[in-house]
Structure formats: structure tokens, C-alpha cells
């Protein structure tokens, strides 16, 4: 499965879209979860409405916000304020049952404002309505990694 | 075990450049953010920046901006600092560091090199 | 940038002693906070990250406590040698800043 590589500013926002065939997925929840490294386990951030008819709901785990559009097959979630540690590798997942099927590998960069310099002083209000999909450039990842991973905060 | 091997002790003229390598062994290295810290004699741990080598775009303390470049190449798991315009304040001992785990949350420096002492004098 | 605060700069114990290291931030960094440990001439070494976590092979007497902008190290009993000096670190943003450092001598 091919990774989309998103960037995203630091402070901003970043859309993510990944998208599934409607009728294959229909009754699923998804599900945006992140990789404990590129072969370790993959960590649940935030899922659609547990009632897969108001999967259109956005729902919020802290800065993360994910809503489904079921009938033209689109998964959205929004990094909102994005931070350096928020860089890493994602998945959509599409969830049946107790399993979980990758729609999407997400690599996200997060890089750093430019203007968002010690002049700027430390109060900074981010602008969470823009969004920023960068070039989504699309590559094939095939590295070893290592076995263990630590714990994210 | 991952390690860290630095090139060796420089001298160097006020006004020059330095380039100090940092070869990562016994890990991966794409996904790992490596950073620079200096130590200046008697000094506290000074952060000068840092790169994830999968993605190739550094960051950098505002203090170093302009002056400081930082790659790495993924085909050999050699991270470069190369700090310009050299002045006396910048003797020091520079660090590269690599994170325990990966990307920027992970960049707690769990491996470290041994230290490049660069020393600019006139 | 996020500026750590270490204190206090110096603290004076004898063995078996128990030292208690802060750092306050000036924002949160949440929990994306490390503890090192410096020996003179000797890189630093990971005592702790995120906040708590103690790094593979560090005694069980080291501990680290807080979030948001507040942070605790401490030692339980200090032992010979934990005499050194100690830093933490942000990483939650750049530049990942360190602390000052708080040096922990020999009464």
C-alpha cells in the first residue's frame, strides 16, 4: 500500500482525505489511527460515530477531528493546531468487527512557520481554520525498522 | 545497539566553516530525528537543531538561523552539521543526538555520539 | 521559543539523600519532557521521557513527575554517583530547548 505524504504548517491546521469504496465499506466505521513507528502497531487517535448512520458527526479526540461521508465514500480528518510531535506515520482504517482494514497510509510533516519567530512573541493565536494539503506526493515506503517501539504521548 | 560515531576534533579560523559527520550504526535511521547539541566549556546543553532524515527538512534554534545547515544522507546513516562564520564563542563541543523513538514526538535523545570538540582560534 | 527553568541551580545533599529537581516551563509543553543526566566529560545520558517514562537501564530511585508546565526529577537515595549535573529538555515544539541545568554536589 502506497503512503501519501502530507505537509502541514505548524500551528495550522491539515486536512486529511482518504478515500473508499462506498458500497465494499458500507455499515463501517473508520477509524484514524498512528503508527508506533513504519511496522509497529497502530495506535487509535479517533473513530466515526459509533452509529454508523451519523458517521457524517464530526467527532473530536483532542485536536483530532474525523467525519465520514458514507454515500461519496470520504474520510476526512482535521489536525488542528499542528504540533512538531504530531509528525509521523498514520492509517484510515476502515473497522469490521474486531478488525481493521488500512484504506490509507498517511506520512505527516509537520514543518515549522516561518514567521513564527522569536519576534512573534510566545502568545500566538494559530490559524486552526486554514487548512494545508501540501504536495501530496506519493512513494512507497519498504524500510526495515526496528522491532520495538516506545510508548507515544 | 544503535551508536553514534562523530569525525574527529577540529581547529579552526575565525570566519571559516566547520562540517562535523555523525554515523548512525546498529538502527534504523529514516524515521529517527537526529540533533545537534552544543556544549561550550563550563556551559549548559545548547539545542541547535534537527532532522528526520525521511522527510529532509531541518529545523533550527533561531539563535543558529543562517549560520547552521543540517542534512543528513539516508544512504550512508550519516547526519552533517556545518556551521559558517566562525566565531570564538563557538567553541565547543558539538553533539549529535539520536531520538528513542521516531519522528519528532520520539526525539527524547536516548543515543548520543561522543562529542566533536571544535575549537576557533585566530 | 519555550524557555525551561531549572531549579535550583545548586543543591547540596549527602548519600542516601533525597534530591528533588524542578523545571517550569514558560507554556505547556504537555508531556514531551526529558531528564538527562551529565558527568563531566561525558556525553549526557536519558534518564526519563515524556514526562515519566524512565529509559531502559535506569535505577528505579530516579523518577519523573508532572506535566504541562511544571516537572519534577527526583532522586529517592542519592547514591555516589548521582553527584552530577542535570538537564531537562522540551520537544514539544521548536527549538527543543534545554534547561540550565541543576548541579547536584556533595554536602
Known amino acids: 500500500l502506497n503512503t501519501t505524504v502530507l505537509q502541514g504548517m505548524a500551528g495550522q491546521s491539515l486536512r486529511v482525505s482518504c478515500t473508499y469504496d462506498a458500497l465494499k465499506h458500507w455499515g463501517r466505521r473508520k477509524a484514524w489511527c498512528r503508527q508506533l513507528g513504519e511496522e509497529g502497531p497502530c495506535q487509535r487517535v479517533v473513530s466515526t460515530h459509533g452509529v454508523w448512520l451519523l458517521a457524517f458527526l464530526k467527532k473530536r479526540n483532542g485536536s483530532t477531528v474525523i467525519a465520514d461521508d458514507t454515500l461519496a465514500g470520504t474520510v476526512t480528518i482535521t489536525l488542528k493546531n499542528l504540533q512538531a510531535g504530531d509528525a509521523g506515520l498514520y492509517q484510515c482504517q476502515s473497522l469490521r468487527g474486531r478488525e481493521a482494514e488500512v484504506l490509507q497510509k498517511v506520512l505527516v510533516e509537520v514543518l515549522e512557520d516561518p514567521l513564527d519567530d522569536q519576534d512573534a512573541g510566545d502568545l500566538w493565536v494559530p490559524e486552526e481554520s486554514s487548512s494545508f494539503e501540501g504536495a501530496q506526493v506519493e512513494h512507497s515506503t519498504s524500510r526495515n525498522q526496528e522491532t520495538s517501539f516506545p510508548p507515544t504521548s | 545497539q544503535v551508536q553514534l560515531v562523530q569525525s574527529g576534533a577540529e581547529v579552526k579560523k575565525p570566519g571559516s566553516s566547520v562540517k562535523v559527520s555523525c554515523k548512525a550504526s546498529g538502527g534504523t535511521f529514516s524515521s529517527y530525528a537526529i540533533s545537534w547539541v552544543r556544549q561550550a566549556p563550563g556551559q549548559g546543553l545548547e539545542w541547535m537543531g534537527g532532522?528526520?532524515?525521511?522527510?529532509?527538512?531541518?529545523n533550527y534554534a533561531q539563535k543558529f538561523q543562517g549560520r547552521v545547515t543540517i542534512t543528513a544522507d539516508e544512504s550512508t546513516s550519516t547526519a552533517y552539521m556545518e556551521l559558517s562564520s566562525l566565531r570564538s564563542e563557538d567553541t565547543a563541543v558539538y553533539y549529535c543526538a539520536r531520538g528513542g523513538g521516531t519522528f519528532w514526538s520520539g526525539s527524547w535523545a536516548l543515543y548520543w555520539g561522543q562529542g566533536t570538540l571544535v575549537t576557533v582560534s585566530s | 521559543e519555550i524557555v525551561l527553568t531549572q531549579s535550583p541551580a545548586t543543591l547540596s545533599l549527602s548519600p542516601g539523600e533525597r534530591a528533588t529537581l524542578s523545571c517550569r516551563a514558560s507554556q505547556s509543553v504537555s508531556s514531551y519532557l526529558a531528564w538527562y543526566q551529565q558527568k563531566p566529560g561525558q556525553a549526557p545520558r536519558l534518564l526519563i521521557y515524556d514526562a515519566s517514562n524512565r529509559a531502559t537501564g535506569i535505577p528505579a530511585r530516579f523518577s519523573g513527575s508532572g506535566s504541562g508546565t511544571d516537572f519534577t526529577l527526583t532522586i529517592s537515595s542519592l547514591e555516589p554517583e548521582d553527584f552530577a549535573v542535570y538537564y531537562c529538555q522540551q520537544y514539544v515544539n521548536w527549538p527543543f530547548t534545554f534547561g540550565g541545568g541543576t548541579k547536584v554536589e556533595i554536602k
Open positions: 532532522i528526520i532524515p525521511i522527510f529532509g527538512t531541518a
